[in-house]
Every structure is written in structure tokens, then in C-alpha cells.
């Protein structure tokens, strides 16, 4: 059974992940329209189901494309200090949270998503899991 310390650690990791995803989303929402329009042609895959930590496998598999689009879209109005480090940190958290005991084959929804929809989906996921832990 999970101990209170392991639950607290999971909660802190989820909060860290949530903040990272929100930071990216805030940066994107600050884009001027034409640039955002171009970014929205970059497609992301969404999980068919995301209700448990193990479903973070679906986020892990889309981190490379996320890093790509953030690198491509850097500008004065949106400059992440180091995209590679940010994605690497997210990846570390995701790996710890989902665990490695069971390797899940991610099931994706038929419809793809824009970067904004993709980030919102995973932000909602983090918020939902955090609320069950508190």
C-alpha cells in the first residue's frame, strides 16, 4: 500500500509536471496570431484514456514532438531558457510517476490535437490525479 510519504512525493512530482506544462502553455498563448496559427498545424496524439499514472506513457511518447515544435517556434516573445533541459526534466518526472513495472502500449484517440489542446489535456490529467491525492 502507498505510504503517506510516497503519496506526498507523487503529489509534488505531479505539481512540478503541472507547472512545467502550464509554463509552456502560457508561453504559447502569448504568441501573436499568425505564429500561433502556424504552430497549430503541428499535430499531437491524445490518449484514448488517461485516468491513471501509468497512462503517462502516452505523454512520454509525445515529448519528442513537443520538444521539436518548441525549438522551431522559439522567438523573442516566447523563449524557454533551455527547451532540451525542460523536456528532459518532464521526461524524468514522467518516468518516475508512471513506473517501470508494467510497460503499457499507449492507446491513442483517432483524432489528433493541436499543441494547446494537447497541453490542456495533460494539465487536466495532472490536476485530476492531484485532487484524488489530497
Amino acid at each position: 500500500a502507498p505510504t503517506s510519504s510516497s503519496t506526498k512525493k507523487t503529489q509534488l512530482q505531479l505539481e512540478h509536471l503541472l507547472l512545467d506544462l502550464q509554463m509552456i502553455l502560457n508561453g504559447i498563448n502569448n504568441y501573436k496570431n499568425p505564429k500561433l496559427t502556424r504552430m497549430l498545424t503541428f499535430k499531437f496524439y491524445m490518449p484514448k484514456k488517461a485516468t491513471e499514472l501509468r497512462h503517462l506513457q502516452c505523454l512520454e511518447e509525445e515529448l519528442k514532438p513537443l520538444e521539436e515544435v518548441l525549438n522551431l517556434a522559439q522567438s523573442k516573445s516566447f523563449h524557454l531558457r533551455d527547451t532540451k533541459d525542460l523536456i528532459s526534466n518532464i521526461n524524468v518526472i514522467v518516468l518516475e510517476l508512471k513506473g517501470s513495472e508494467t510497460t503499457l502500449m499507449c492507446e491513442y484517440a483517432d483524432e489528433t490535437a493541436t499543441i494547446v489542446e494537447f497541453l490542456n489535456r495533460w494539465i487536466t490529467f495532472c490536476q485530476s490525479i492531484i485532487s484524488t491525492l489530497t
Partner: antibody
Framework: EVQLVQSGAEVKKPGESLKISCKGS????????IGWVRQMPGKGLEWMGI????????RYSPSFQGQVTISADKSISTAYLQWSSLKASDTAMYYC??????????????WGQGTTVTVSS | DIVMTQTPLSLPVTPGEPASISCRST????????????LDWYLQKPGQSPQLLIY???YRASGVPDRFSGSGSGTDFTLKISRVEAEDVGVYYC?????????FGGGTKVEIK
Amino acid sequence: EVQLVQSGAEVKKPGESLKISCKGSGYSFTSQWIGWVRQMPGKGLEWMGIIFPGDSDTRYSPSFQGQVTISADKSISTAYLQWSSLKASDTAMYYCARQGRSYHYYGMDVWGQGTTVTVSS
Amino acid sequence: DIVMTQTPLSLPVTPGEPASISCRSTQSLLDGDDGNTLLDWYLQKPGQSPQLLIYTLSYRASGVPDRFSGSGSGTDFTLKISRVEAEDVGVYYCMQRLEFPLTFGGGTKVEIK
């Protein structure tokens, strides 16, 4: 090896229908846009439109909207370009090309060998 | 639509000599304040499919020799070949992907003198 293989040359009469294909291999076909480019005899390249096979999201250049239909079958990693009623002016070489996860942020890095379409009575 | 204009239409070249092709767009191809310039160069060799040479203004595509280079800013762009080789003959096209629909230049035919 990453490649796009197109269907063979076609000779058709005006008013006939046609569907040409472009089969991708060696990469995740569903995760990259596939564009279609026309080259009329002795002329330059014209960008016709594009499809994302993962969800069949399709965008057409205004010049080609309503003239052709772009589709894809992700189960067999194939994109299609079709005409319901061919005209003599559709005589051209047609190329498919891969364009990454966003057609704004990636060049057309892999091209098919082209399909020659001849429309003549 | 963004119109792409290439000059010259035809370019006779001498092997070993440099060559330069110009491309002009009707609006700036800069993506955002200091983002990427969304311009590519393609080469179509005789009887072949086009191939990507240079992407995002100045990045050489995989396998492209370093004698090819792309430069420019805003609306004026140049493709340079430092020392032309016989295998470089064909038609060169610039293409913008800043705005939909994507558009090609009319092409520049490079041939050996």
C-alpha cells in the same frame, strides 16, 4: 529506408475519373503530412494541398479546391489524389512528398517518383 | 497568396566557377519577431523528382554537399553554389511555407556552358 512509392502512369479520356496513390514506408506514416505537387509539361512546381494521414485533416490550395480530392488510408500507409471528371488541362506529372508534423515548419524532404497523368480524347 | 519570383530564368555556368540564384517574395518570410525564415530550395535534376537542398533559409538537407548555401532575409534570398559541378545541372526552385497556400518560385534552369 524512408520512401514514397507512387502508382504507375495513367492515360485517360476527358470526363473519366481517376485515383492515383502514394505509399509510404520506413517511417511513421500517420505522423507526417503528405503533400501533392503538380508539374505541367515543361512548367514549374505547383503546391496542390496536403493531408495528415493520422486523422485525415486535409488542406487545399485555393487553386485546386473543388478540382481534386486528397485522401488517405492509414491502415495501408497510402495517400491518394483523385479526380471525378478529368480535363485535358489535368495532363501533368503529379508528385507526393512528405512534410513532417507541420507543413509550416518542415520542408518536403522525401518525394515520390511521380505519376504521369495524360488526358486526351 | 505570397508570390515567389526567381531570377535569372536561365543560368549558364562553367564547372568550377561559383553560381548564384535569387528569389524574392512579396512579403517577409520571417516567422515572428526573430524566428525562422520559412524558405526552402529544391533541385529537380533532368528526368528526376525534386529534392530538398536547403530548408529554413540556410540549413542543408541530409546528404547535400557543402558547396550549396542559402542566405538572405525578409524578402530577398540567395542560393549559392561555391564551385559548380556537372551534376548540379537542373531546375532550382525556392518555396515559401510561411503562409497557406505554400508557393514555389517559377524556377531557374542551371546548365553547363
